[in-house]
């Protein structure tokens, strides 16, 4: 047994451009809190798989109100560690999910509103009893800095918290077969605590709570001898004629204990040792109440005021499962364009784009302009899977390599005549019109419609469009 400890150092904008908007405002002050979820082994970090190693919620942080005009700073954090107790051995390799939640403190009907601000996930190797490990994770434009460690709860020691230590009974040395406990040299490694009732003569254990039998003995508690003589049937009553004692069906066969309970034989029947949150003869009853906070992801817990009444989690949009622990498959709507691969990271959807595409939804076609230059001062414009050049005046064609006839599009209005010019085109306007494209009528009184003709140009003069 032991405790995983998580210390959040900072949560704020990450480096680089695109600083995130502050999650709080003067109109909607808010505060942060964190949730950590641990899973054994290098398992997938999917939000919907249960936090088999445990989970914990932090306290709420101080109330934060954005200062208008100021850049989003590191946000004020809750005090203290997040602690996830583990009952069995520390697995050494684990996966984690750390969620940053925002609690808005405005005048919402029905109390404060929660929303997930960021989720980071990772897989790590960690020995119990080691020093604090530091980590930095980014989620979008946010950055989370934290440290973590796993420590054993006495009397457990070791990198997996499976060895047990006791104070020395004698000052000089430990008992037979027992070593000193490093780093606690004044303590001795203690025998493991096997399953309750495990035969001290015929059983042993390598992990706390188990009971493994020496050769010649069987049964959950290693109390049943196995005959090596002429017993033919592997199961059945004892045979008086052969002197065989063959165990009959045991009450723990097939493990009648539900929800991960462990079965122990008793003189009359069996007994289930239930994990936390379950009880009943076969651990079939959930003892979790709404006070235990069983609903994840902002789910609302209803009922379950006492261990005898069931609770129900009403999940917010986007979550499902009996504890709101499963995320709806938002990727099934296929939001990624151009063949991009959709990843649901919880706090956001991400698209992994195929080569040649970019953008949050792979909407930008990089191949349009990659390795292609537009000639004669043209600029490349992305779009639609085919590159397009916006050509400088006097040039046209796909790559701006062709000399364009600037008058081909008949740019001069109201019957104006177009002349190609080295720097573009010139319109000679018909009487009564003026402007670079002859677009402005000249009023009968000699005044022109806005904009006025530049000084030095009379209405009707050819005007060069620059």
């Amino acid at each position: 047994a032991g405790v995983f400890e998580l210390q959040i150092h900072s949560f704020g904008p990450g480096p680089g451009p695109g600083a995130p908007r502050s999650p709080c405002s003067a109109r909607l002050p808010c505060r942060l809190f964190f949730r950590v979820c641990l899973k054994p082994g290098l398992s997938e970090e999917a939000a919907e798989s249960p936090c088999a190693l445990g989970a914990a919620l932090s306290a709420r942080g101080p109330v934060y109100t954005e200062q208008p005009g100021a850049p989003a700073p590191d946000l004020p954090l809750p005090d203290g560690l997040l602690q996830v107790p583990f009952r069995d051995a520390w697995p050494g390799t684990f996966s984690f999910i750390i969620e940053t939640w925002r609690e808005e403190l405005g005048d919402q009907i029905g109390g404060p509103a929660w929303s997930l601000l960021a989720r980071v996930a990772g897989r790590r190797r960690l020995a119990a009893g080691g020093p604090w490990a530091r980590d930095i994770q980014r989620a979008g434009a946010w950055e989370l800095r934290f440290s973590y460690r796993a420590r054993c709860e006495p009397p457990a020691v070791g990198t997996a918290c499976t060895r047990l230590c006791r104070p020395r009974s004698a000052p000089s040395r430990c008992g037979p077969g027992l070593r000193p406990c490093a780093p606690l040299e004044d303590e001795c490694e203690a025998p493991l605590v096997c399953r309750a009732g495990c035969s001290p003569e015929h059983g042993f254990c390598e992990q706390p709570g188990e009971c493994r039998c020496l050769e010649g003995w069987t049964g959950p508690l290693c109390t049943v001898p196995v005959s090596t003589s002429s017993c033919l049937s592997p199961r059945g009553p004892s045979s008086a004629t052969t002197g065989c004692l063959v165990p009959g069906p045991g009450p723990c066969d097939g493990n009648p204990c539900a929800n991960g309970g462990s079965c122990s034989e008793t003189p009359r029947s069996f007994e289930c040792t239930c994990p936390r949150g379950f009880y009943g003869l076969r651990c079939e009853v959930s003892g979790v109440t709404c006070a235990d906070g069983p609903c994840f992801n902002g789910g609302l817990c209803v009922g379950g005021a006492d261990p005898d009444s069931a609770y129900i989690c009403h999940c917010p949009p986007g979550f499902q499962g009996s504890n709101c622990e499963k995320r709806v498959d938002r990727c099934s709507l296929q939001p990624c364009r151009n063949g991009g691969l959709c990843l649901d990271l919880g706090h956001a959807l991400r698209c992994r784009c195929r080569a040649g595409f970019a953008g949050p939804r792979c909407e930008h076609d990089l191949d349009d302009c990659a390795g292609r230059a537009c000639a004669n001062g043209g600029t490349c414009v992305e779009g639609g899977g085919a590159h397009r050049c916006s050509c400088a005046l006097g040039f046209g064609g796909r790559d701006c390599r062709e000399r364009a006839d600037p008058c081909a599009a008949r740019p001069c209005a109201h019957g104006g005549r177009c002349y190609a010019h080295f720097s573009g085109l010139v319109c000679a306007c018909a009487p009564g019109y003026m402007g670079a494209r002859c677009e402005f009528p000249v009023h009968p009184d000699g005044a022109s419609a806005l904009p006025a003709a530049p000084p030095g140009l009379r209405p009707g003069d050819p005007q060069r469009y620059l």
């Epitope: 949009p317 709507l333 296929q334 364009r337 151009n338 956001a348 959807l349 909407e363």
Partner: nanobody
Framework: EVQLVESGGGEVQPGGSLRLSCAAS????????MGWYRQAPGKQRELVAG???????KYAESVKGRFTISRDNAKNTVYLQMSSLRAEDTAVYYC??????????????WGQGTLVTVKP
């Protein structure tokens, strides 16, 4: 903030028809993908029909030929025309949209759901 408002749910007999609509409003720059999910009691939420990010339509196998999704881009609205309804279509139908906000961020939004009940 973006709101998705569904309407059109109700009770209908097997073989009957219903038309659901979902209107998106708020600080929307563009709608990237939009569609309908449903969740029957005790079941996972599943996509029924939708317009994908590439603009194509997608249908669940169980509704092909019976349901038709359409949209009105000017009104930021999608519709689900449901015909030949069966008892197994009974569920809460949720509108969902992947939206590009005015801030240029993309966010995924859900409606509150509308109940469709098919029973004789």
């Amino acid at each position: 903030e973006v709101q998705l408002v569904e309407s059109g749910g109700g009770e209908v007999q097997p073989g009957g028809s219903l038309r659901l609509s979902c209107a998106a409003s708020g600080s929307i720059f563009s709608i990237n993908a939009m569609g309908w999910y449903r969740q029957a009691p005790g079941k996972q939420r599943e996509l029924v029909a939708g317009f994908t990010g590439d603009g194509s339509t997608k249908y669940a196998e169980s509704v092909k030929g019976r349901f038709t999704i359409s949209r009105d881009n000017a009104k930021n609205t999608v519709y689900l025309q449901m015909s030949s309804l069966r008892a197994e279509d009974t569920a809460v139908y949720y509108c969902a949209a992947d939206v590009q906000l005015l801030s240029s961020d993309y966010e995924f939004y859900w409606g509150q759901g509308t109940l469709v009940t098919v029973k004789p």
